[in-house]
Interface confidence: low
Amino acid sequence: QSGPLPKPSLQALPSSLVPLEKPVTLRCQGPPGVDLYRLEKLSSSRYQDQAVLFIPAMKRSLAGRYRCSYQNGSLWSLPSDQLELVATGVFAKPSLSAQPGPAVSSGGDVTLQCQTRYGFDQFALYKEGDPAPYKNPERWYRASFPIITVTAAHSGTYRCYSFSSRDPYLWSAPSDPLELVVT
């Protein structure tokens, strides 16, 4: 053995943000010839010894952190990075606005504001086409998302979600889309 078994990848298809009652597939991908996979939901006793978990209709109880590993011979791989499976549409959608407005000159500043009438303490902003929340690496934000020195790359469609830190995998429906235009 020349090194530890590399960790597999775990992905959610089509997305890790899943509207309630919609389908999602979790797929664990290791090297060819794997003897056995283990796909599990953390902080629960739920696991399966298969590489693919098909969820035909997303439920609140299925939201949470998942990870997988695989076995070759008697050896187990390092675990995959955790995948956070989020149920969306649990709460009413927030509103997303741009200050001073959705049309901004290149080099200017704009602030996207996500507002909700509920007492949520967490907000996430997504740009269409980007896999991660806006302003990675810090994952969650308050209601204001400042974009300093706007460039053409910031153009696009944005949506935000609100949720509570008490239930971090149960999110609101997405806001109506906001089109940011950089001139």
Partner: antibody, heavy 114, light 106 residues
């Protein structure tokens, strides 16, 4: 070759803040997480928190309000920031790769004292 | 948070002998336990992950077993270079170290 190297201030005043940098080589921060662990003098190892490849973070619950972990993927650097320091934060601080922690730095010693 | 109770806190054994260290988790950790060797002036070294999988280059004198909440780590044919402090680590939900076991040679 995988390597992690911690660098810190050495001495910090009580109620001050601590900033430590972990510079990594031999792997990409987009594909691996990095943990922070400390060891007070004469005591055991204590996990502080972790930043994942995608940038999300986990923290030990008792330290969550005082800790912040961030990174700069392009510079292969991970940053630990801790505020409201107390004398019992005196420890050797280590960074270590991913889950479980398969590679470690040698650590940097931090003393909290006036 | 998951707690890990490691015992004993110290032990002494003879060269060629065998020692066993145990860790008990406060809840089922589904075999997500690792064992580390820590020598003064160095960073800890990962010996075993996922209960029993040895890291490359780690001698087969080291072994691990267990399930549920109860886990053990053993060193057989003890060597002078095994003098160190050993820690268990659960990584089922966040991470928690055991308190450590300081191993001395008689």
């Amino acid at each position: 070759e995988v390597q992690l190297l911690e660098s810190g201030p050495g001495l910090v005043a009580p109620s001050g803040s601590l900033s430590i940098t972990c510079t990594v080589s031999g792997f990409s921060l987009t594909g691996y997480g990095v943990n922070w662990v400390r060891q007070p003098p004469g005591k055991g190892l204590e996990w502080l928190g972790m930043i994942w490849g995608d940038g999300s973070t986990d923290y030990q619950s008792t330290l969550k309000s005082r800790l912040s972990i961030s990174k700069d993927n392009s510079k292969s650097q991970v940053f630990l920031k801790m505020n409201s320091l107390r004398t019992d934060d005196t420890a050797r601080y280590y960074c270590a790769r991913d889950l479980p922690m398969d590679y470690w730095g040698l650590g940097t010693s931090v003393t909290v004292s006036s | 948070d998951i707690q890990m109770t490691q015992s004993p806190s110290s032990l002494s054994a003879s060269v060629g002998g065998r020692v066993t260290i145990t860790c008990k988790a406060s809840q089922d950790i589904n075999k997500y336990i690792a064992w580390y060797q820590h020598k003064p002036g160095k960073g800890p070294s990962l010996l075993i992950h996922y209960t029993s999988t040895l890291q490359p280059g780690v001698p087969s004198r080291f072994s691990g077993s267990g399930s549920g909440r109860d886990y053990s780590f053993s060193i057989s044919n003890l060597q002078p270079e095994d003098i160190a402090t050993y820690y268990c680590l659960q990584y089922a939900n966040l991470l928690t170290f055991g308190g450590g076991t300081k191993l001395e040679i008689k």
